[in-house]
Interface confidence: low
């Protein structure tokens, strides 16, 4: 990510105590928060600043992906003297401020977690009254989302020499183990993990040659659960169909 010259002396694990009036900008966020898909998570963020008794207008911002440049997922603004931070942006309506920015707390609640929410989040506060100042966490908090397996695609495809192959793709965190079962197969573990970048939760398993007609079942399993889907191969009818 782009580095800036903003002073970002952030202490994530241990809040430094600074004696007044030499308080300086700092932000305290944990390295990581973990939760299951479908649940809610709280991203803690507290800060200190050098402007004693500041009660002017302020904006609280959370962004995802990278600091300073990542897309905003939440933004709220508080008028002078107000403890109410009026929400201006909440991506998909799932982000809600839990903390009170007037009390140096920007903690955010994320509802209905999905695997796509598994990324790093950065909190930022901006003062815009008599004092113009801003500060953003540099390394942010990693939201680690876990999920039971879900088979996202199962299909039968033609392969050379009039043969057929089957593909099964599942998502989950931890990435699930995949196994195929079917006619004359027993259990075939043929999982090939996709690269982590961008598709870190997807796993694909291929059956390269389907030798018998019948039902082929893909099972995805991780520590949180399991999921099954099947495809049916009918070569003699000149078609293949899938049923889940």
């Amino acid at each position: 990510f782009v580095r800036t010259k903003i002073d970002t002396t952030e202490n994530l694990l241990n809040t430094e105590v600074h004696s007044s009036p030499a308080q300086r900008w700092s932000m305290q966020v944990p390295p990581e928060v973990s939760a299951e898909a479908g649940d809610a998570a709280v991203l803690p963020c507290t800060f200190t600043h050098p402007h004693r008794h500041y009660d002017g207008p302020l904006t609280a911002i959370w962004r995802a992906g990278e600091p300073y440049a990542g897309p905003q997922v939440f933004r709220c603004a508080a008028a002078r003297g107000s403890e109410l931070c009026q929400t201006a942006l909440s991506l998909h309506g799932r982000f809600r401020l839990l903390g009170n920015p007037r009390r140096n707390d920007l903690s955010l609640r994320v509802e209905r977690l999905a695997l796509a929410d598994d990324r790093r989040y950065f909190c930022r506060v901006e003062f815009a009254g008599d004092v113009h100042d801003r500060y953003e966490s540099r390394h942010g908090v990693r939201l680690h989302v876990t999920a039971a397996p879900r088979i996202v695609n199962i299909s039968v495809l033609p392969s050379p020499a009039h043969a057929f192959r089957a593909l099964c793709t599942a998502e989950g965190e931890p990435p699930p183990a995949l196994a195929w079962s079917g006619p004359a197969l027993g259990n075939s573990l043929a999982a090939v993990r996709s690269p982590r970048e961008g598709h870190g939760h997807l796993v694909t398993a291929e059956l390269p040659a389907l030798t018998h007609d019948g039902r082929y079942t893909c099972t995805a399993a991780n520590s949180l659960g399991r999921s099954e889907a099947s495809v049916y191969l009918f070569r003699f009818h000149g078609a293949s169909g899938a049923s889940t």
Partner: antibody, heavy 120, light 107 residues
Framework: EVQLVESGGGLVQPGRSLKLSCAAS????????MAWVRQSPKKGLGWVAS????????YYGDSVKGRFTISRDSAKSTLYLQMSSLRSEDTATYYC?????????????WGQGVMVTVSS | DVQMTQSPSNLAASPGESVSINCKAG??????LAWYQQKPGKPNKLLIY???TLQSGTPSRFSGSGSGTDFTLTIRNLEPEDFGLYYC?????????FGSGTKLEIK
């Protein structure tokens, strides 16, 4: 194969300083948070300090804050722990550990450890 | 800090048997507990995290259970290489804290 090899331990008098090193290999050093964890017969395993990818942020356990400094040199794939104002209770085996990339609060690889004895 | 209490401190068993090691957190840590194995002359090994998820390379005879404050590591059908020290660690919050350890010995 991931390898972490600590060095620099030994016998040191109370109040003096010592610097530990940890040579990392088998992975991209700059992609991981790193840590020092220590173990003594009295206190068992205890987290000492951690450092982020590029050394910008450092984190310390309460018992060493202000006395120990964790640092890293990505060009050398080496982690350091500068220990000053050493006390007898700092006597322990010190392990270099790699933070797991998915769970930043776990240690997925450890070194064999290096012994530090603080005694007069 | 979250206090981690591990029991028993010593355990003797024979190959083929099953054993359980307990770990109790001073406050709720959700499911975020890890187990490590320590053997002389070898680096510590992460076995289980998030209470029950096996780290890659951990044999299936190891299993973890529990949530909140009470957790258990179970080893079924003990193999000779399973003997050694076991530690729990909460990975719910900083500072990261460990249990005091359980020494598993051959009977």
């Amino acid at each position: 194969e991931v390898q972490l090899v600590e060095s620099g331990g030994g016998l040191v008098q109370p109040g003096r300083s010592l610097k530990l090193s940890c040579a990392a290999s088998g992975f991209t050093f700059s992609d991981y948070y790193m840590a020092w964890v220590r173990q003594s017969p009295k206190k068992g395993l205890g987290w000492v300090a951690s450092i982020d990818y590029d050394g910008y942020n450092t984190y310390y356990g309460d018992s060493v804050k202000g006395r120990f400094t964790i640092s890293r040199d990505s060009a050398k794939s080496t982690l350091y722990l500068q220990m000053s104002s050493l006390r007898s209770e700092d006597t322990a085996t010190y392990y270099c550990a790699r933070h797991d990339s998915r769970f930043g609060s776990l240690f997925d690889y450890w070194g064999q450890g290096v012994m530090v004895t603080v005694s007069s | 800090d979250v206090q981690m209490t591990q029991s028993p401190s010593n355990l003797a068993a024979s190959p083929g048997e099953s054993v359980s090691i307990n770990c109790k957190a001073g406050k709720s840590i959700s499911k975020y507990l890890a187990w490590y194995q320590q053997k002389p002359g070898k680096p510590n090994k992460l076995l289980i995290y998030s209470g029950s998820t096996l780290q890659s390379g951990t044999p299936s005879r190891f299993s973890g259970s529990g949530s909140g404050t009470d957790f258990t590591l179970t080893i079924r059908n003990l193999e000779p290489e399973d003997f050694g020290l076991y530690y729990c660690q909460q990975h719910n919050e900083y500072p990261l804290t460990f249990g005091s350890g359980t020494k598993l010995e051959i009977k």
